[in-house]
Interface confidence: medium
């Protein structure tokens, strides 16, 4: 039994670092490997991951871990039964993946804008809650070519749009996702997305 | 070279005080975790105390907690233990060593306590 | 709190002898252990951590092997100087703990 692929390992910067590898061959994630790992830090204790399989010979690994700091450092080591594959580390901050942001609302009775309204992922006292910015994706169901992305570069999770921007009698999805430009982190996962139908009075023109 | 030079052992009663010392060079003492560690007339070794390089963090096994404080004076390059409350089971030959996260990477010669009435 | 057996508190042993040194522990440790060499008289001194990565300035005749609860210790060809108390650590569990220690003895 051998890796094919190293783990590599993400963290949401809060409780949870998933870390994910290949091996050789069809392999029982659960049954036959353990994935060990433990803080660089006086005293601390290590843990064992038990992984999950991640298709025929992909596993992955969901770590859970304390608070997160800048300077923490874990050392990782993969085994099956008393035999170690692998020995690597893993610093979190430099590999974050923020959390998706949650709660994605559209308010439709605005006049004739749209506000796009989501909850910011992280409680006020992590580092990240403060840091993170966002990319809002607004597609009709209709008409593929109607896809766009809005950058939120502001902290509050809002985004104000005319309605008159989109199209009129329509159903369109949005979704939301998340980076942090301090931590140079990956971008989130998409929110789940939320769906409504766009209609509003079109302005009477003038003569 | 890194040195730890322990002192301050000697003959007490039991239910008696001590302080022990340890002077450290070397190293950049404030950046390490330090740990007493001793020896018992058997030869078996037991960590007693360690705190963290700054000084805020402190731990203790439950045969000592409450009776053994440990300190340090980063200004000093100095490794502190109180002792009190003494009893004959803490007879042992007393080593100042530095603690690389887990394991005792550098010890000091030691000073031995002798607790008898 | 984890027990470590060294099963064997002392054994002679004739100089370039290869020795083998054994540690048990009571639980499987992954690797978290170290071992250390005192000399009669002298401070322990950290020779292996991880079960196998040799210490900076230790000579290679010394090595570590073993995984889950069994360790062992390995001089491939015993030295005057290697007359001495061998102990081992574990630090997978808070408080760490040692091993009863080996003495080396030349016949």
């Known amino acids: 039994m051998k890796v094919l692929q190293e783990p590599t390992c993400v963290s949401d910067y809060m409780s949870i670092s998933t870390c994910e590898w290949k091996m050789n061959g069809p392999t029982n994630c659960s049954t036959e490997l353990r994935l060990l790992y433990q803080l660089v830090f006086l005293l601390s204790e290590a843990h064992t991951c038990i992984p999950e399989n991640n298709g025929g010979a992909g596993c992955v690994c969901h770590l859970l871990m304390d608070d997160v700091v800048s300077a923490d450092n874990y050392t990782l080591d993969l085994w099956a039964g008393q035999q170690l594959l692998w020995k690597g580390s893993f610093k979190p901050s430099e590999h974050v993946k923020p959390r998706a942001p949650g709660n994605l609302t559209v308010h439709t009775n605005v006049s004739d804008t749209l506000l796009l309204t989501w909850s910011n992922p992280y409680p006020p006292d992590n580092y990240l809650y403060n840091h993170l910015t966002y990319a809002v994706n607004i597609w009709s169901e209709n008409d593929p070519a109607d896809f766009r992305i809005y950058n939120v570069t502001y902290l509050e999770p809002s985004l104000r749009i005319a309605a008159s921007t989109l199209k009129s009698g329509i159903s369109y999805r949005a979704r939301v996702r998340a980076w942090a430009q301090c931590y140079n982190t990956t971008w989130s996962e998409w929110s789940p997305s939320t769906k409504w139908h766009n209609s509003y009075r079109e302005p009477f023109e003038q003569h | 070279e890194v040195m730890l030079v322990e002192s301050g052992g000697g003959l007490v009663k039991p239910g008696g005080s001590l302080k022990l010392s340890c002077a450290a060079s070397?190293?950049?003492?404030?950046?390490?975790?330090m740990s007493w560690v001793r020896q018992t007339p058997e030869k078996r070794l037991e960590w007693v105390a360690i705190?963290?390089?700054?000084?805020?963090?402190?731990y203790y096994p439950d045969s000592v907690k409450g009776r053994f404080t440990i300190s340090r004076d980063n200004a000093k390059n100095t490794l502190y233990l109180q002792m009190s409350s003494l009893r004959s089971e803490d007879t042992a030959l007393y080593f100042c060593?530095?603690?690389?996260?887990?394991?005792?990477?550098?010890w000091g010669t030691g000073t031995t306590v002798t607790v008898s009435s | 709190d984890i027990q470590m057996t060294q099963s064997s508190s002392s054994f002679s042993v004739s100089l370039g002898d290869r020795v083998t040194i054994t540690c048990k522990a009571s639980?499987?440790?992954?690797?978290?252990l170290a071992w250390y060499q005192q000399k009669p008289g002298n401070a322990p001194r950290l020779l292996i951590s991880?079960?196998?990565s040799l210490e900076t300035g230790v000579p290679s005749r010394f090595s570590g092997s073993g995984s889950g609860r069994d360790y062992t210790l390995i001089i491939t060809s015993l030295q005057t100087e290697d007359v001495a108390t061998y102990y081992c650590?574990?630090?997978?569990?808070?408080?760490?703990?040692f091993g009863g220690g080996t003495k080396l003895e030349i016949k």
């Open positions: 060593a530095r603690l690389h996260y887990w394991y005792f990477d550098f």
């Open positions: 070397g190293f950049t003492f404030s950046s390490y975790a």
């Open positions: 705190i963290s390089g700054g000084g805020d963090s402190t």
């Open positions: 639980e499987d440790l992954y690797n978290r």
């Open positions: 991880g079960a196998t």
């Open positions: 650590q574990q630090y997978w569990r808070n408080p760490y703990t």
